[in-house]
């Protein structure tokens, strides 16, 4: 007897973090023997959607023409072959940005920092939030994810970086969120450019990345270092 059918692969284009009103396509890729694809959304009646496979039958497309809060959540997909249903795919978490007003991102003591010194990026929201994310432009994932203990609401989160090196230079943004749905994020903050200059020990200027509108993922998203900030927030490395 053959083993269970291999699980399909589930992904979203242009990514799994989509701003309000924008289109997103969810893809489920199975095998050439697939006859039908099913998409399930957690806490929604199953199946959430069904699609016939696209030629050559190894994948199906599920389209969301305009992202809203209703579409944010965790998805899994399955395919049916002549021998039955596959195992579920790994989950896809579809996150919507634009649910809350944008936070403010600043650098303390300054966005101009000497290599080897310390800097703290401060993300502040107008209303109390319990989750804050810091991203670096062109990074595919958040660098830091700070969540408050026991759902305590905060107006800000600190992201300390120490010691700073030239690779910390670049453009950052932050998002805020409520814990009751980590699938809903705020609008992004305005960008903050962190400029790192050479240290006294190394008089050569470190190359700083100019503000870029490129959207590709960086190979190695940089993790800021330092102690847990004094904000009642837990640090979650992504």
């Amino acid at each position: 007897q053959a083993g269970p059918l291999p699980k399909p692969t589930l992904w979203a284009e242009p990514g799994s973090v989509i701003s309000w009103g924008n289109s997103v396509t969810i893809w489920c890729q199975g095998t050439l023997e697939a006859r039908e694809y099913r998409l399930d959304k957690e806490e929604s009646p199953a199946p959430w959607d069904r699609q016939n496979p696209l030629e050559p039958k190894n994948k199906a497309r599920f389209s969301i023409p305009s992202m809203t809060e209703d579409y944010a959540g965790r998805y899994r997909c399955y395919y049916r072959s002549p021998v039955g249903w596959s195992q579920p795919s790994d989950p896809l978490e579809l996150v919507m940005t634009g649910a809350y007003s944008k936070p403010t991102l600043s650098a303390l003591p300054s966005p101009l920092v000497t290599s080897g010194k310390s800097v703290t990026l401060l993300c502040q929201s107008r209303s109390p939030m319990d989750t804050f994310l810091l991203i670096k432009e062109r990074a595919a994932h958040p660098l830091l994810h700070l969540r408050s203990e026991h759902g305590a609401q905060q107006h800000q989160a600190e992201f300390p970086m120490s010691p700073v090196t030239s690779v910390h230079g670049g453009t950052y943004r932050c998002f805020s969120s409520h814990g009751f749905s980590h699938y809903l994020l705020s609008h992004p903050s305005d960008p903050l450019e962190l400029i790192v200059s050479g240290s006294l020990e190394d008089p050569r200027p470190s190359p700083t990345r100019s503000v870029s509108t490129a959207a590709g993922p960086e190979d190695q998203p940089l993790m800021p270092t330092g102690s847990v900030p004094h904000s009642g927030l837990r640090r979650h490395w992504e």
């Epitope: 990514g15 940005t97 634009g98 609008h187």
Partner: antibody
């Protein structure tokens, strides 16, 4: 520095098919949205449609029945085909890029120089 | 489809003046609005995206504000090189409609 260059015939007769290509140099076609915009003489900008680098498209409803946008990632090019052209399709045609980052989108941040297309019998 | 309406369609101001151009969407578009500048005979240039985020390299005298349906582009101190036509554009769900443009001239 990413640069876009439109190419294609400048003069067409009514009922012919307009074919334009936009070549992307100095950067990758992935992972961006690529758009076509046109501007009739002395008038404003009109969005034609876009293609995501993977091939997903979205068209202006007023042009949808005549329009095809495609992408060739191996050549770093994307193309526009507009069938059954009339004098109303006379315009400068631009290609442009829209970037996507974690959870937000840029505007059309890189544009080609534009190519003039005239439809006349 | 959502319509984008700019006002005024043209305006004339003096060097150093504060200039305001407005853009109204027929439905809520949150902050997914961009502003472009097109100088005579030139290619459009992105000034502002996400309603208020200044594009890299754009002078700080340009600013954007608004959300929902009402948006504003402000030039804090008009310079001779700002003579151009300015367009707003919604760019969340397709179609990515442009406003009809505002032609700005120097008195």
């Amino acid at each position: 520095q990413v640069q876009l260059q439109e190419s294609g015939p400048g003069l067409l007769k009514p009922s012919e098919t307009l074919s334009l290509t936009c070549t992307v140099s100095g950067g990758s076609i992935s992972p961006y949205y690529w758009s076509w915009i046109r501007q009739p003489p002395g008038k404003g900008l009109e969005w034609i449609g876009y293609i995501y680098y993977s091939g997903n498209t979205n068209y202006n409803p007023s042009l949808q029945s005549r329009l095809t946008i495609s992408v060739d990632t191996s050549k770093n090019q994307f193309s526009l085909k507009l069938s059954s052209v009339t004098a109303a399709d006379t315009a400068v045609y631009y290609c442009a890029r829209r970037g996507y980052s974690f959870g937000f989108y840029y505007g059309l941040d890189v544009w080609g120089q534009g190519t003039t297309v005239t439809v006349s019998s | 489809d959502i319509q984008m309406t700019q006002s005024p369609s043209s305006l004339s101001a003096s060097v150093g003046d504060r200039v305001t151009i407005t853009c109204r969407a027929s439905q809520d578009i949150s902050i997914y609005l961009a502003w472009y500048q097109q100088k005579p005979g030139k290619v459009p240039n992105l000034l502002i995206y996400l309603a208020s985020t200044l594009q890299s390299g754009v002078p700080s005298r340009f600013s954007g504000s608004g959300s929902g349906t009402d948006f504003t582009l402000t030039i804090s101190s008009l310079q001779p090189e700002d003579v151009a036509t300015y367009y707003c554009q919604k760019y969340n769900s397709a179609p990515w409609t442009f406003g009809q443009g505002t032609k700005l001239e120097i008195k």
